[in-house]
Structure formats: C-alpha cells, structure tokens
C-alpha cells in the first residue's frame, strides 16, 4: 500500500513538475526590466527564449520573436537545449510512468517490469528536473552578468552613435517557476526510485520442505514469516544515474546587454 | 468615432474648487488610459498625470500632488480633473487625452478654460 | 525630470518652401526592447486642442499630410515640413513619451514668411 502511494505520489509530483517546466519554458518572463533605481519608464521590457516583449502605459504589449538561430548567444540556446532536453524526457518518463503504475493493470505486466519501468521514469524525471534546474540557472548566471555590466551602451542610431542607457534586467517570475518545477521533477523521480525497491518481487533461497514423522503426518513449512534480510536472489544493482548533465564554466563573451533581438 | 467631450468654461474665487468632466465615447473606456494637459495663457503644454481606469492606477508629476485629484466613473464613461484650494496661476485650459498605442495622445478633448479671479 | 529642448522658438518660412524643427531630449528616448524612439510630435492651432502629427519619432499618424516627416534617434530629433503650406501655421511642440514624468518641448511657432 505505501509503495503504490509513493509511486502514485511521485507520479503526480512529477506531472506538475513536468508541466511547470513546459510552462516555464514557454513563458516570456524570464527576464524583466529592473526597475529599482531607475527613472520610471511609460515603457516596460521583459524577455524569453523564444521572443522579448514591451509592454507600454497605453497597454499595448508588442512582442518580437527571435528569428536568427545563429545570431543568438551560445548561452541561450544552450538553455533552450537544456529545457527541450528536460521536456522530452519527462514526457517520455511520464509516458513509462503510467504504465509502470501499480494500480493500472496491462495485461499480465510482471511485478519485475513494472519495477524496472518505475525506476527508468524515476531515472528520467531526475534527469529531466536537472536539466530544468541546470537550464534556468545558467540563465540567471547570465543576467547577474550582464546586470554588472556597463549601465551606458552604444547605438548607431539615425543621426549616428547614440548615447543611451542600458535596459537592466533581473529576474522573471520563469525563472522561479523553473525551479520549483525542476525541483518538483526530481522530488518526484526520487519517489519513483524509492518505489521501485518495494516493487520489486522478493525470492526466498529457501524451499518449503516437509518432514514425513514416521508415525505422524504432520508437515513443518519453515519460513512462516519473511524477513527482508536483503539477502534473497533479488539482488540487482539499482544504480541512479544522473545522466552525464555536466555544466562546463567557460569564459564567455557575454553579450553587452541581455537583448537578442 | 472617437470623441473626447469636456465641460464647459468655470470661473472661480481663489479658495474654491472645480470639476473638470470629460466625457469618452466611440470606444471602450476601461481599454485606455485619460491623460491631463494643462496650457497657462501663451504658455506651452504641461502634463500633469493619468489615469488608468482598467487597473485602477493613477500617476501625477510632481507640481500635481495634493490638490489636484484624478478619478472616473466607468459607468458614464467620464473622467474628472478636481481642483481644490485655488490659485490664480492655475487659471489655464485644461485638455485630457486619450493615450493610446505607442504612448501617443491620438484623441484630445476640447479644452476646458478655468479662470481664478477674485 | 527629462527636459526637451525645442529650436528654434519660432520660424518664418515661405510657402512652398522647407521648414524644420528641432528637438532635443536631456536623456535617451530609445527603448532597446523594441528599438523604438517613443517621442511624437503634435501641431497646435490657435483656439484648438494639439493634434497628433509623428509618433515614435518617424511613423507619421493616419490622415497626417505627407509632407510632415520625423526622423531622429536617442536625443536628437527633427520635424521636417517639406513644403509649407498655409494651415501649416501653428505651434509645434515635441513630447516623450517613455519617462515620467512626460514631458513636452517649450513649442516653435511657425509663420509664413
């Protein structure tokens, strides 16, 4: 009963987890305009993965995509990389969860196949929620990066170089949502892996014997209880692997202001 | 078509108060925000604040603070410019103007003259 | 605040001929979000209210005759009136529209020669 609970559990943790990533991921604030210490502006910016977007005091909102794929900075994409990554896999450990499921009956689905596919969704959803988490930060990295930098920034404007000041960014409400959501991922993959141990079937390495008394019929089944001593022949190896999900700390040249339009 | 439609000229003594309406037609009030323009006789324009009526949000510059009270009334869809405690140098026309896309005032109001004279 | 600065005060041009207009903002009017100046420009005539002539800077607003045109980027800024005509005679004033307080030019009045 506390295994199907903690597999249910996970699974539903998971799920939310999942969708927060999608959601994170689609949504346009992952970085906003700083506006403390900051004139106050009738135009506000905010900016996401895919496009950047003003907002005005008239309430007209113009949003841009970002249509160069190589223009934009290495550290984007990767964060664009990192999400997809994390979607697909928690989609596909979502998809193997379900039918993982000890409530849900397919078949006549061994107890051991549905605790290898409990422990694969739990190994995806780790990966899956590290690569959300890993995403979203390294972003952030960049904002605090690029926030320190130069507050003055040239343009060639109409008349020729232009003095204006730097937009500041800080951080969107995505970026929190990314978190949580990546945070929930791997809380709920961890309930999967925990699951999949009480899934598992447990063999004796012991025989039921009976013992034939030469007057008497009476048979003696030693092992009346079951101790899991963790001895038995279930003695597979359930290794959690974290997917090789590396971040390597190269020097980047960062571009002046965080605006990939 | 869109109208901005003002009330007519006041005269007032210093001291008293006056109720500038303007009245919005041939579009949805809550959508867009009323701005307030004032023009002292020869003198250039001067913005004095807005109002949002879908959020609620008011906003004055700096020499508008006090006295000077921006409100609605998104039933009749009119906004109001209430003067308080008056001054002769606030004899001047008052404008209000729609802001719409870009930031621009693309509608204006007639103009109401205030005259401050004891 | 931000100060915008108008020249000349006032202009006497014939008819026919080029007028123009300058402006200039005590800070940068230039949004990188969308790399839109948020500066407009707006005709008064005596008697009436302004009328909305350029916003962002260049993009001219429904019904405007054609011969009005801005240009400018970050703190510079120009009206150009290429061919004056008689109801041209007004008060242009220059306005930004991207910090608060809004501010507005101190106006050029513009006369026929």
């Known amino acids: 009963m506390a295994v199907t609970a903690c597999q249910g559990l996970g699974f539903v943790v998971s799920l939310i987890g999942i969708a927060g990533i999608i959601a994170a991921t689609c949504m346009d604030q992952w970085s906003t305009q700083d506006l403390y210490n900051n004139p106050v502006t009738a135009v506000f910016n905010y900016q996401g993965l895919w496009r950047s977007c003003v907002r005005e005091s008239s309430g007209f909102t113009e949003c841009r995509g970002y249509f160069t794929l190589l223009g934009l900075p290495a550290m984007l994409q990767a964060v664009r990389a990192l999400m997809i990554v994390g979607i697909v896999l928690g989609a596909i450990g979502l998809l193997v969860s379900i039918f993982a499921l000890k409530c849900i009956r397919i078949g006549s689905m061994e107890d051991s196949a549905k605790a290898n596919m409990t422990l694969t969704s739990g190994i995806m959803f780790i990966v899956s929620g590290l690569c959300a988490i890993a995403g979203v930060s390294v972003f952030a990295n960049m904002l605090v990066t690029n926030f320190w930098m130069s507050t003055a920034n040239m343009y060639t404007g109409m008349g020729g170089m232009v003095q204006t000041v730097q937009t500041r960014y800080t951080f969107g409400a995505a970026l929190f949502v990314g978190w949580v959501a990546g945070g929930l991922t791997l809380i709920g993959g961890v309930m999967m892996c925990i699951a999949c141990r009480g899934l598992a079937p447990e063999e004796t390495n012991y025989k039921a014997v009976s013992y034939h008394a030469s007057g008497h019929s009476v048979a003696y089944k030693p092992g009346g209880f079951k101790a899991s001593t963790g001895f038995g022949s279930n003695t597979k190896n359930k290794k959690i692997y974290d997917g090789g999900a590396r971040t390597e700390d190269e020097v980047q040249s960062y571009p002046s202001k965080h605006d990939y339009v | 078509q869109i109208q901005l439609v003002q009330s007519g000229s006041e005269l007032k003594k210093p001291g008293a108060s006056v109720k500038v309406s303007c009245k919005a037609s041939?579009?949805?009030?809550?959508?867009?925000?009323i701005n307030w323009v004032r023009q002292a006789p020869g003198q250039g324009l001067e913005w004095m604040g807005w109002?949002?009526?879908?959020?609620?949000?008011?906003t004055y510059a700096e020499g508008f603070t006090g006295r000077f009270v921006l409100s609605w009334d998104t039933s009749v869809s009119t906004a109001y410019l209430q003067i308080s405690s008056l001054k002769a140098e606030d004899t001047a026309v008052y404008f209000c103007?729609?802001?719409?896309?870009?930031?621009?005032?693309?509608?204006w109001g007639q103009g109401t003259l205030v005259t401050v004279s004891s | 605040d931000i100060v915008m600065t108008q020249s000349p005060d006032s202009l006497a041009v014939s008819l026919g001929e080029r007028a123009t207009i300058n402006c200039k903002s005590s800070?940068?009017?230039?949004?990188?979000?969308?790399?839109?100046?948020?500066l407009a420009w707006y005709q008064q005539k005596p008697g009436q209210p302004p009328k909305l002539l350029i916003y962002?800077?260049?993009t001219r607003e429904s019904g405007v005759p054609d011969r009005f045109s801005g240009s400018g980027s970050g703190t510079d800024f120009t009206l150009t009136i290429s061919s004056l005509q008689a109801e041209d005679v007004a008060v242009y004033y220059c306005?930004?529209?991207?910090?608060?307080?809004?501010?507005f030019g101190g106006g050029t009045k513009v006369e026929i020669k």
């Open positions: 103007a729609r802001l719409y896309y870009g930031n621009r005032f693309d509608s």
């Open positions: 041939g579009y949805t009030f809550t959508n867009y925000g």
């Open positions: 109002i949002n009526p879908n959020t609620g949000e008011t």
């Open positions: 800070q940068s009017l230039l949004n990188s979000g969308n790399q839109r100046n948020y």
């Open positions: 962002w800077a260049s």
């Open positions: 306005q930004q529209a991207y910090y608060y307080p809004l501010t």
